[in-house]
């Protein structure tokens, strides 16, 4: 009893073609069939009397075949026989192309043969490999072969039986004198204990066969010296099984909560300082000259759109300057040289004269705005939502969808700082990155609008007929200095037309 072993080493099919010359599609996925039979002077078709074996697909076109004897014995190929080795043989090796995974003959293309070789000769039992190379017009196969005795068989023809064993009760061969000689990887008096993979952890690993390292629960790695972290652990490690010790900047049971948004995402722009303020939350402290949630906006005095009536704003070192369109003048282009006679109101706006025809005001229809009703209302164009809030048009109105941590109609309130209503006298609270700010109503000032100040009584333009208005700071009242031809506390009466009193 013995084994004919065939070691395929290299197959060359540079053009990737079948024996017919037809190119393989998609490349020659090559497997081999081997037929071993009794010696024939001319090797001819017929039964493979000594055995047959097939390989899986071993490569495409040209490839080397690696030795895989330790991993299951695919190469060398094994052709066992149960008789006294006769010392002669015939061998047929066929290379076939399999386009798919099914290697049965009927699943192959009709011209699947890549090459076939046939050799015959003498071969004695022994450990030495005979190297051979066969070349056809299109292919070359390099291989080696030998005959060795089966376990427990010895002699020139593998006909002498000896009780060596390789099972649960021992793993040894018979020496010429009958003593046990342990097979590689085994130890002990009867060669029953496997020698595990070198370095396999003594406590966390074990083996049931040589060069193996099987891990106990909670351990992994080639040598079973790496713990398995808690299932789902994202940014963490373990030192004992099932732990999840978080890496720096991460938290939570599975270390999947980002506690260091600043470092991981660098959200602050323009050299701003980033401060973590909770899971996936941060605050940017802007450098002078920048604003916005991420300090992404450059401050400009024109940002508040101070120029009215379509005036264009130009930034200057000491402030700004309004360039007024024709028909307007003043610091903010707030004065008009037009009157209703000039039909200044667009989009169906109706004109109302003011100051006895010296000025006018446009009453705009719905969906239009501007001094002359020249702008279509998009209540979100002015970006009214603060702190990164999202402006949403809702028909005739608008609303702001606030980022977490902000509230108020315009997301102007930081939940934490403005929640206690710190601004006195109806002041509006604004939550800033480093605290809050109060915008005070007329007549009040101070950090919290706690200081009462005088009111500019002239702000409402109470004087008629181009009279000059002066504010009396001591009484918060106004005085009108009438031009020639007008009298009255507001210069509302022309001279010569006395007021008509009701009594």
């Amino acid at each position: 009893s013995g084994v004919f072993q065939l070691q395929l080493q290299e197959f060359i099919n540079e053009r990737g073609v079948l024996a017919s010359g037809r190119p393989c599609e998609p490349g020659c996925r090559t497997f081999f069939r081997v037929c071993l039979k009794h010696f024939q002077a001319v090797v001819s078709p017929g039964p493979c009397t000594f055995g047959t074996v097939s390989t899986p697909v071993l490569g495409t076109n040209s490839f080397a075949v690696r030795d895989d004897s330790s991993g299951g014995g695919r190469n060398p190929l094994q052709l066992p026989f149960n008789f006294t080795w006769p010392g002669t043989f015939s061998l047929i090796i066929e290379a076939w192309h399999a386009p798919g995974d099914d290697l049965r003959p009927e699943a192959l293309p009709p011209d699947a043969l890549i090459s076939k070789i046939a050799i015959q000769g003498s071969l004695a039992v022994g450990q030495n490999w005979l190297l051979d190379e066969q070349t056809s017009t299109l292919t070359r196969l390099r291989y080696s072969y030998r005959v060795i005795c089966s376990d427990n068989y010895y002699g020139d023809n593998c006909s002498r039986l000896c009780k060596k064993r390789n099972d649960h009760f021992g793993h040894y061969v018979c020496q010429p004198d009958g003593n046990l000689s342990c097979l590689p990887g085994w130890t002990g008096e009867y060669c029953q204990q496997p020698i595990c993979l070198s370095g396999c952890h003594e406590q966390n690993g074990y083996c049931s066969k040589p060069a193996e390292c099987l891990c106990r629960p909670g351990w992994q790695g080639r040598l079973c010296n790496e713990c398995i972290p808690h299932n789902g652990c994202r940014h963490g490690t373990c030192s004992t099984p099932w732990q999840c010790t978080c890496d720096e900047g991460w938290g939570g049971l599975f270390c999947d909560q980002d506690l260091n948004y600043c470092t991981h995402h660098s959200p602050c722009k323009n050299g701003a300082t980033c401060s973590n303020s909770g899971q996936r939350s941060y605050t940017c402290t802007c450098r002078p000259g920048y604003t916005g949630v991420d300090c992404e906006l450059e401050l400009s005095e024109c940002d508040s759109n101070p120029c009215r009536n379509g005036g264009s704003c130009k930034d200057q070192e000491d402030g700004y300057h309004c360039l007024c369109p024709p028909g307007y003048y003043g610091l903010h282009c707030e004065h008009s040289t037009l009157s209703c006679a000039d039909s200044p109101c667009f989009n169906g706006g109706s004109c109302r004269e003011r100051n006895q025809g010296a000025n006018y005001a446009c009453e705009c229809p719905p969906n239009f705005t501007g001094s002359n009703c020249e702008k279509k209302v998009d209540r979100c164009t002015s970006n009214p939502c603060a702190n990164g809030g999202q402006c949403l048009n809702r028909g005739p109105s608008r609303m702001c969808r606030c980022r977490p941590g902000f509230t108020g109609t315009y997301c102007e309130l930081h939940v934490s700082d403005c929640a206690r209503n710190p601004c006195a006298h109806g002041g509006t609270c604004h939550d800033l990155e480093n605290g809050l700010m109060c915008t005070c109503p007329a007549g009040f000032s101070g950090r919290r609008c706690e200081v009462r100040t005088s009111i500019d009584a002239c702000a409402s333009s109470p004087c008629f007929n181009r009279a000059t208005c002066y504010t009396d700071l001591s009484t918060d009242t106004f005085v009108c200095n009438c031009p020639y031809g007008f009298v009255g506390s507001r210069c509302e009466f022309p001279v010569g037309l006395p007021p008509s009193f009701p009594w």
């Epitope: 024996a19 017919s20 001819s44 076939w96 049965r104 003959p105 009927e106 699943a107 011209d111 043969l113």
Partner: antibody, heavy 119, light 106 residues
Amino acid sequence: EVQLVESGGGVVQPGGSLRLSCAASGFTFGSHWMSWVRQAPGKGLEWVADISNDGRYAYSADSVKGRFTISRDNSKNTLYLQLNSLRAEDTAVYYCAKAGGGNVGFDIWGQGTMVTVSS
Amino acid sequence: SYELTQPPSVSVSPGQTASITCSADNLGNQYVSWYQQKPGQSPVLVIYQDGMRPSGIPERFSGSNSGNTATLTISGTQAMDEADYYCQAWDSSGAVFGGGTKLTVL
């Protein structure tokens, strides 16, 4: 019983078209490559085309390339040959044959269907 | 393209051995099939892979292939063996058939 039955032959003018069918039974049609082979009157056998079991690969002889198309419908166990731009030299008995995988040859043949191209 | 060359005719007496050859360059590198066709009938596969017989084909049919020549041998030829015989192999464009050999049993 393993059987292949061709149909669709007939007389057609040069430049005309025909579609031949081959109904298979008695074996797992979708597992095998199939072929068409023709034989002109008094002449030898000439391979025309073959197609893989799943229909992904198809080949044809140079003499018919661009004119004849082989196809199959595994759900109907049927092989087809579409013949276009027919010429007088295409006159032949057309056989449908099962191509044995792995260089076994054509192990099952139909009875053949005659195609005559004549004006 | 690849050409398989067969003798147009071979004659043999009943009971004698008939040999039909098929030649091409390096034909021994390929597997050859042989077909028998009787008048008015479809071809029948009689030998595949050089010398293997399908079931139902009599043992008197055998084949071999080496070098540049494949041979179909019919030993103990019978009258019923009279037919056309075609060899077949493959080339880069597809299947290739020999021109055919008419076997006459005298």
